[in-house]
């Protein structure tokens, strides 16, 4: 068309929120969709001045399509003024946003209400228990198995005796980490389960109960004394 | 006996810099999270700084967010609080305090073991 | 951040007869585990503060059973059952459910 105009915004419900406040860490989008002809050229400043790539670590990205600016793994230093300038020939028009980066506070681990659940089985079965770790800070876990030893669950100390049955390693996901498979269960394997899951503010943990049915059309079979565990 | 030792206090000029160490033992240092804690003479008690047990995670008060950094040393049992910029209001007693360690606990998990902490005077 | 409430400023206490200590937080120290995450301390003059109670209400190894402590979500009381002389000095009440940990302004237990 050779109807000239001066840039106007197309969509100016996507630029009604004009204060965001983002985690660190987050990304952040801001949008000014715009039309005009010829189509207008987009720029941006950060508080007044020209935004440029090197005033942030890693940069930012603008989609020219899209009429965006994409901040990624947003800090404190990012916080401010972000206006876009929409212009051609026949005219500018901007907007302004605020983006203001909250830094959460970094919590204990939180373990979802609930997780591990309690289990049953029949000997020979399998099983598995979950947990669902949220943490701010890097969580280290570990599922733990209370044993006996001697016949006693607890030591001299009167602390309960443990064995650490999986724990985040290098090679371990937080994926793998969060599932404990117990495969062709016998009745030593009845007992308490924790998953525990640390932090360098503090450690959570939640237990739960494995019970061991004899098999169907089977006696309950007699089984030895177990190994005790070192 | 699990034992916090801290050094490196002293008087010191706003503006200059200072390390604080703090060598722990018998415990495994390696372990557990450590924490710095304050306390103005005469007034209460301060939070500072956390680093978590393998140094990947640190965190700080508002205070000092900036000016203090915290690290640590597994091979020699060692904590630090590398205290640029300092100014008047950080002058304080700062205690080494041991944070939560990585595994089950059936007592508190930290916060249990102070060192006597060492003084720092920041004066003109 | 945590705000900690401690009440109140002072204490003078007959040896023998009981003494009470509250500290309230702005936020629920109530955690997803079950457990509330109030510490209490006492540090004497010239000493580093020592470890009461943790998790609202257990006592720390060592502790006489003459101290307890008490509470539900953002309301803690510590107790001296009979005070002794050895009791003397300054008792905190610290959050430690999330950074920055955050300490109650102390309150001073004297004999009188």
């Known amino acids: 068309s050779n109807n000239k105009r001066a840039p106007y915004w197309t969509n100016t419900e996507k630029m009604e929120k004009r204060l965001h406040a983002v985690p660190a860490a987050n990304t952040v989008k801001f949008r000014c969709p715009a039309g005009g002809n010829p189509m207008p050229t987009m720029r941006w400043l950060k508080n007044g001045k020209e935004f440029k790539q090197e005033h942030r670590i890693g940069g930012y990205k603008v989609r020219n399509q899209h009429w965006s600016l994409i901040m990624e793994s947003v800090v404190p230093s990012d916080k401010g003024n972000y206006t876009c300038v929409v212009e051609n020939e026949y005219g500018s028009i901007n907007h302004t946003y605020h983006l203001d980066v909250v830094e959460r506070s970094p919590h204990r681990p939180i373990l979802q209400a609930g997780l591990p659940a309690n289990a049953s089985t029949v000997v020979g079965g399998d099983v598995e228990f979950v947990c669902k770790v949220y943490s701010d800070a890097q969580p280290h876990i570990q599922w733990i198995k209370h044993v006996e030893k001697n016949g006693s669950k607890y030591g001299p100390d009167g602390l309960p005796y443990l064995k650490v049955l999986k724990a985040a390693g290098v090679n371990t996901t937080d994926k793998e980490i969060e599932v404990l498979y117990i495969r062709n269960v016998t009745f030593e394997d009845a007992g308490e389960y924790t998953c525990l899951a640390g932090n360098s503010i503090g450690i959570s943990f939640h237990s739960a109960w494995l019970t061991v049915l004899p098999a169907p059309g089977r006696e309950k079979e007699i089984t030895a004394s177990p190994d005790y565990l070192e | 006996e699990v034992q916090l030792l801290e050094s490196g206090g002293g008087v010191v000029q706003p503006g200059r810099s200072l390390r604080l160490s703090c060598a722990a033992s018998?415990?495994?240092?390696?372990?557990?999270?450590m924490h710095w804690v304050r306390q103005a003479p005469g007034k209460g008690l301060e939070w500072v700084a956390v680093?978590?047990?393998?140094?990947?995670?640190?965190y700080y008060a508002d205070s000092v967010k900036g000016r203090f950094t915290i690290s640590r040393d597994n091979s020699k049992n060692t904590l630090s609080l590398q205290m640029n910029s300092l100014r008047v209001e950080d002058t304080a007693i700062y205690y080494c305090?041991?944070?939560?360690?990585?595994?089950?606990?059936?007592?508190?998990?930290?916060?249990?073991?102070w060192g006597q902490g060492t003084m720092v005077t920041v004066s003109s | 951040d945590i705000v900690m409430t401690q009440t109140p400023l002072s204490l003078s206490v007959t040896p023998g007869q009981p003494a009470s200590i509250s500290c309230t937080s702005s936020?629920?120290?109530?955690?997803?585990?079950?457990?509330?995450?109030v510490y209490w301390y006492l540090q004497k003059p010239g000493q580093p503060p020592q470890l009461l109670i943790y998790?609202?209400?257990n006592r720390f190894s060592g502790v006489p059973d003459r101290f307890s402590g008490s509470g539900s979500r953002t309301d803690f009381t510590l107790k001296i059952s009979r005070v002794e002389a050895e009791d003397v000095g300054v008792y905190y009440c610290?959050?430690?459910?999330?950074?920055?940990?955050?300490f109650g302004g102390g309150t001073k237990v004297e004999i009188k």
């Open positions: 305090v041991r944070g939560a360690g990585r595994g089950y606990t059936y007592g508190p998990d930290g916060f249990d073991i």
């Open positions: 018998g415990f495994t240092f390696s372990s557990y999270a």
């Open positions: 680093i978590s047990y393998d140094g990947s995670n640190k």
């Open positions: 936020r629920s120290l109530l955690h997803s585990d079950g457990k509330t995450y």
């Open positions: 998790e609202l209400s």
């Open positions: 610290m959050q430690y459910i999330e950074a920055p940990l955050t």
